[in-house]
Interface confidence: low
């Protein structure tokens, strides 16, 4: 057979051959960082000629060209500098907002050597819409400027850029945009492993959090997978074994998949793993219908037995057939378990496709994905039951459009990636799941279904019961620590009689815990300013309780996410390297931030936290409270910047017994505690015998109701001092 000519050098770069100079061999060019090869690859045809994939004209000389990042096409309500047609590696672009608009995202972004901008899309927002301004990523054009419930925005990319993410997004009832942020990228760009690992890991841990069996189990089951426990994940690993994948690369595909399997089995969830290799045809090495798919050693041994030569007779890339074999597997399992059964309906499915190119036979893989979505009944409510991760490896012939089309679209998550080489893939799978931090105490997960109990909706919520007087409330922030208010403990220090009542799936009345130790902020002294005519002062009104035993995590008992921690960072799906300031900017991002607290009867009540100018006018009212503060000259003496303020308009006010409870917000279907209930000017439960009835303050009341909550962003040093070993704090 003829061989292909050897005059294929690239100036300034190098190349590798998958099968020497023989027909079928793939020649892959690479360039130093900051440059990209043009063309990226060539294929040796049976005629003995080199062919450049996608090229229309005859062979051109291969060169290394400088990588550039796309320029903003439009930037609303602000300006950016410098204004260039595209930006060189290392070049910066800066953003500023017009008056009245607040900058969200990164004020300065730098072009990275992979042709991608660092940081996050800059947006100038005034917080006016039902959903936040979704922004316009660099290189994109957006149509649609209304951000009300049901409004849609559409995106396209300028010139030859490729769109990844959602081309259309809708503002949903929960104030979140559907789909995932669109990004415009150069066709030659790729992802760095250090970006992919957390992005993939975050999305995956979100899914694992949802899959985690949360029923009470009475004894530790260790790492053994208990199939009868609720919550099941089917993981389908699809490994490309087509001609363009070298034997060495295939080994790395296998090794990466083994890493993934090892990690996934470390989570205490029920998992079945399918292994499928494919080229022109798929080969199922392990099916989820096989009991061995639940056994880690069996799965890994079937991976090890995957043979590169299995596909030597058919060397195309038939991604459709690979995905269709997943569909057939699902179909068989559905028939076996019964379409209507919970056993079938409660399985979550994750497909990881590892490929090095675009499909070139067998029809559109999108058709198979549509079939899969249909059989799993994927709709807005069941969106969590399917995740498809499309990972392209090698910059050669990977088709961004196809990968993007196959990958799932979920808010704040990415499911489509292109990595430079298999080494990078290995790195990603090594770092994507830090099991030790994630397993069972995943934070801020509340059951939002209509038939969930109050405790399932807010499983962090606890009641602190002294033997006499009022109760207080608090929040689990780990499996042994509760955050509450210091003023709950002002009557002496004997906590041996106190009990903390924590949710328990076996009892609608919860389970009582003794307190091992109470850590009360030394700065708290209700009479500290008595001499100034301030009869009560609630600065530093914060305390931590360590429970005598660890709480078993369940649907009814689970910590809330504390901002400025790694746990919250994962839940917010923010990049690694985020800071406490980033969390504050993301969570308290409007003049009026909708938040909640839990009432005496367990229901979730709504408030609005006032920020900026509105905070000042919210706090101002305290000067009208002549009983508690007879001769107050400066409101700031009472309402320091340690406090968040609510209680205006239609806000509910907390009752006396609700002190210490969490003030929390919902983001991305997870819950974050930003404050704790401290004090207020009005008690809606006064004179009410029934904990279900609250009295609204009469409109004529002077002063009007106001409520003040300790702002956890202002208590960071104290929290870090006492919880440094319990939570993983981010830099301030």
């Amino acid at each position: 057979a003829p061989s292909c000519p050897q005059n294929v050098n690239i100036s300034g770069g190098t190349f590798t051959l998958s099968h020497g100079w023989a027909p079928g061999s793939l020649l892959t060019y690479s360039c130093p960082q900051g440059l990209y090869p043009s063309p990226a690859s060539r294929l040796c045809k049976s005629s003995g000629q080199w062919q450049t994939p996608g090229a229309t004209r005859s062979l051109s000389k291969a060169v290394c060209k400088p990588v550039r990042c796309p320029a903003p096409v439009s930037f609303e309500n602000g300006i950016y500098t410098p204004r260039l047609g595209s930006y060189p590696v290392g070049g910066n672009v800066s953003f500023e907002c017009e008056d009245g608009f607040i900058l969200r995202g990164s004020p300065v972004r730098q072009c990275r050597p992979n042709g991608m901008w660092d940081g996050e899309t800059a947006v100038c927002d005034n917080g006016a819409g039902h959903c936040p301004n979704p922004g316009i990523s660099l290189g994109a054009v957006r149509t649609g400027f209304r951000f009300g419930h049901g409004d849609k925005v559409r995106y396209r990319c300028s010139s030859n850029l490729v769109l990844t993410g959602s081309s259309e997004r809708e503002c949903q009832g929960n104030g979140v945009w559907s789909g995932t942020e669109p990004i415009c990228r150069q066709p030659y760009s790729y992802d760095f492993p250090e970006d992919v690992a957390p992005a993939l890991g975050t999305s995956f841990s979100h899914m694992l959090g949802a899959t985690n069996p949360t029923q009470k189990t009475k004894e530790s089951l260790g790492r053994k997978i208990q199939i009868q426990r609720s919550g099941h994940l089917n993981l389908y690993l699809l490994l490309d074994c087509s001609q363009s994948v070298s034997e060495n690369d295939f080994l790395i595909f296998k090794e990466s998949a083994s890493l993934m399997v090892d990690r996934i089995f470390s989570f205490e969830i029920n998992v079945s793993v399918a292994i499928i290799t494919f080229a022109s045809e798929p080969k199922v090495l392990m099916s989820v219908l096989n009991d061995n798919s639940r056994d880690m050693t069996e799965v890994i041994s079937s991976l090890e037995n995957a043979n590169y030569k299995d596909h030597e007779n058919g060397t195309g890339t038939n991604t459709y057939a690979a995905l269709n074999s997943v569909y057939l597997m699902m179909n068989n399992q559905m028939r076996l378990l019964g379409m209507e059964t919970m056993a079938w309906q409660e399985i979550r499915h994750a497909i990881i496709l590892l490929t090095d190119g675009k499909s070139n036979m067998g029809g559109s893989p999108k058709t198979a994905v549509d079939h899969i979505r249909e059989i799993l009944n994927i709709n807005q409510k069941r969106n969590d039951y399917l995740d498809i991760y499309a990972i392209g490896v090698g910059k050669l012939d990977v088709d961004w459009r196809e990968l993007n089309e196959l990958g799932s679209k979920k808010d704040g998550e990415r499911h489509a990636f292109i990595l430079q080489d298999t080494k990078a893939l290995h790195q990603v799978f090594e770092h994507m799941l830090d099991v030790s931090k994630l397993t069972d105490t995943i934070c801020g997960v509340g059951n939002m279904s209509a038939n969930a109990s109050d405790q399932e909706r807010t499983p962090w919520h606890v009641t602190i019961k002294p033997k006499s007087q009022e109760t207080c409330r608090g929040a689990l922030i780990s499996d042994q620590w509760v955050l509450t208010a210091a003023h709950c403990f002002r009557d002496g220090n004997d906590h041996s009689l106190w009990r903390v009542n924590v949710g328990d799936p076996k009892s609608q009345w919860g389970k009582e815990f003794l307190i091992e130790k109470a850590v009360i902020s030394p700065g708290f002294d209700v009479f500290a300013k008595k001499n100034q005519g301030i009869l009560e002062f609630y600065g530093d009104d914060i305390a931590l309780l360590k429970l005598a035993q660890k709480v078993k995590m369940s649907t009814h008992a689970r910590p809330i996410c504390l901002p400025c921690t790694m746990e919250a960072n994962l839940a917010l799906r923010r990049p690694q390297g985020s800071t406490c300031r980033d969390h504050e900017n993301e969570l308290l991002n409007k003049q009026s931030v909708p938040a909640h607290f839990v009432a005496l009867n367990g229901s979730k009540l709504n408030i609005n936290l006032k920020m900026g100018v509105e905070w000042t006018s919210c706090a101002e009212v305290v000067s009208q409270e002549k009983t508690m503060f007879p001769n107050l000259t400066d409101v700031r003496e009472v309402v320091t910047d340690q406090f968040l303020c609510s209680g205006t308009q239609e806000d509910e006010s907390p009752c006396k017994g609700e002190s210490g409870g969490a003030v929390f917000l919902e983001r991305r279907f997870r819950f974050f505690q930003v404050g704790l209930v401290s004090w207020g000017l009005y008690n809606p439960c006064l004179g009410s015998a029934d904990k279900n009835s609250r009295k609204r303050a009469p409109r004529s009341k002077v002063p009007p109701p106001r409520d003040f909550h300790i702002n956890l962003f202002r208590m960071q040093p104290w929290l870090r001092q006492h919880l440094g070993d319990v939570l993983n704090f981010l830099p301030l």
């Epitope: 029923q215 009470k216 189990t217 009475k218 609720s230 038939n451 109990s453 328990d504 799936p505 076996k506 009892s507 609608q508 009345w509 919860g510 009867n601 015998a689 029934d690 904990k691 279900n692």
Partner: antibody, heavy 119, light 106 residues
Framework: QVQLVQSGAEVKKPGASVKVSCKAS????????MYWVRQAPGQGLEWMGI????????TYAQKFQDRVTMTRDASTTTVYMELSSLRSEDTAVYYC????????????WGQGTLVTVSS | SYELTQPPSVSLSPGQTASITCSGD??????TCWYQQKPGQSPVLVIY???KRPSGIPERFSGSNSGNTATLTISGTQAMDEADYYC?????????FGGGTKLTVL
């Protein structure tokens, strides 16, 4: 000592209503929940509902939702259970029972009140 | 709706160990209580929270609960233990009783 004393036996016609009382003594009335359970002749126990003596809030079993009303009078530490639209199959002994929390069980029971529904 | 199933009757001789079972879907994930009822009397709580005994209940009464089955065990059964026994649990704010088991001491 804890005592739950129920009102006496009743004979009612179909379609009528009956109101059974249960007077609690010997403990802090508002600290414990009060439950109503019935037992038809020769049959098992059937839960009817719960009342919170402190606030008066109630939860009824689905089966009795439309016909039962539970109330309490904190001043006399008495709880009441009224069942309307009586039918012959409502003939049973009706018990009140006290409980601290669900998982602690019903730790004290009244002596029972026999309600006979007959035309 | 949630159901608890008990055997209608269990018979044994004095001094033997009686085991009365109560089964329900994932019952091990819920707390179970047991009641004893003698003819013409009100029920008496003998076990709460799966395996705890109220004061005044003899040590020969014990309970366990895992998987789909809760069990009441009476070791060294005596003639005075002859009665109906009911298991009970909670399912989303509703108390559910088993059908009852008649324990006969021969």
């Amino acid at each position: 000592q804890v005592q739950l004393v129920q009102s006496g036996a009743e004979v009612k016609k179909p379609g009528a209503s009956v109101k059974v009382s249960c007077k609690a003594s010997g403990y802090s009335f508002t600290t414990y929940y009060m439950y109503w359970v019935r037992q038809a002749p020769g049959q098992g126990l059937e839960w009817m509902g719960i009342i919170t003596p402190s606030g008066g809030s109630t939860t009824y079993a689905q089966k009795f939702q439309d016909r039962v009303t539970m109330t309490r009078d904190a001043s006399t530490t008495t709880v009441y259970m009224e069942l309307s639209s009586l039918r012959s199959e409502d003939t049973a002994v009706y018990y009140c029972a006290r409980g601290y929390e669900g998982s602690y069980g019903f730790d004290h029971w009244g002596q029972g009140t026999l309600v006979t529904v007959s035309s | 709706s949630y159901e608890l199933t008990q055997p209608p009757s269990v018979s044994l001789s004095p001094g033997q160990t009686a085991s009365i079972t109560c089964s329900g879907d994932k019952l091990g994930n819920k707390y179970t209580c047991w009641y004893q009822q003698k003819p013409g009397q009100s029920p008496v709580l003998v076990i709460y929270q799966d395996n705890k005994r109220p004061s005044g209940i003899p040590e020969r009464f014990s309970g366990s609960n895992s998987g789909n089955t809760a069990t009441l065990t009476i070791s060294g059964t005596q003639a005075m233990d002859e009665a109906d026994y009911y298991c009970q649990t909670w399912d989303s704010s509703t108390a559910v009783f088993g059908g009852g088991t008649k324990l006969t001491v021969l």
